[in-house]
């Protein structure tokens, strides 16, 4: 899989994360920090 | 299957304002980004801003700084382009379209007329 | 905001031609670049994105190149069904379109 960093267009998207562009899936990823998950990294869990 | 289902055709007068809006099904508009795009007849496509549903916020091309309004009803699932002080050259099909968890899927786009 | 300066703004070619089309961003967009197909009476279709990134069910005969500010999408064989307009987009800095390319048959 070809991945590269999000575009600036994308700033803010990961909440608590890192936003990874997925180039042959045509799709934004948030990889989160630890103690979040959801799509954009937006839930905090213990 | 995911989809982005728009409003119905407008016609409206010089002067007043248009709201349109875009329902998302099979997907949370909150993952995403809805960008908005319209295309006057004849002409290319023009993108006029976004917004991002989770936060609320919003960026817009400067020239419809002050006459758009893009706002998210994230309980309903929900995206909606305000354009106010329409003039003719406003007439155009207005499109929604998702950005973030895939990459640019288009609704099927809204006709609006100005016309006296 | 970054402009997309696309041309030619239309041209005519012979089925099995190779036709190119060129995108100039008027600073580096790093390769975030899309090609959208538009046929009349519909929504832009998707052909490729991140440069060359050609969406599944698009034929091989579509592509795109570039870096920086320069970006191409090429047709290495027209074929009757291509007739349309094409425009490129770039989204590295929110998003703005070329001023589109029509496609005809000569």
């Known amino acids: 899989v070809s991945i590269t960093k999000c575009s600036s267009d994308m700033n803010g998207y990961c909440l608590h994360g890192q936003c990874i562009y997925l180039v042959d899936m045509s799709q934004n990823y948030c990889r989160c920090e630890v103690g979040y998950t959801g799509v954009r990294c937006e839930h905090f869990f213990l | 299957q995911d989809q982005l289902v728009q409003s119905g055709a407008e016609v409206k007068k010089p002067g007043a304002s248009v709201k349109v809006s875009c329902k998302a099904s099979?997907?949370?508009?909150?993952?995403?980004?809805i960008q908005w795009v319209r295309q006057a007849p004849g002409q290319g496509l023009e993108w006029m801003g976004r917004?991002?549903?989770?936060?609320?916020?919003?960026k817009y091309r400067e020239k419809f700084e002050g006459r758009v309004t893009i706002t998210a009803d994230t309980s309903t699932n929900t995206a909606y382009m305000e354009l106010s002080s329409l003039r003719s050259e406003d007439t155009a099909v207005y499109y929604c379209v998702r950005s973030g968890t895939l990459f640019d899927f288009w609704g099927q786009g809204t006709l609006v007329t100005v016309s006296s | 905001r970054i402009q997309m300066t696309q041309s030619p703004s239309s041209l005519s070619a012979s089925v099995g031609d190779r036709v190119t089309i060129t995108c100039k961003a008027s600073q580096d967009i790093h390769k975030y670049i899309a090609w959208y197909q538009q046929k009349p009476g519909q929504a832009p279709r998707l052909l490729i994105q991140y440069t060359s990134t050609l969406q599944p069910g698009v034929p091989s005969r579509f592509s795109g190149s570039g870096s920086g500010t320069d970006y191409t999408f090429t047709i290495s064989s027209l074929q009757p069904e291509d007739i349309a307009t094409y425009y490129c987009l770039q989204y590295d800095n929110l998003r703005t379109f070329g001023g589109g390319t029509k496609v005809e048959i000569k």
């Open positions: 099979g997907f949370n508009i909150k993952d995403t980004y």
């Open positions: 917004i991002d549903p989770l936060r609320g916020n919003t």
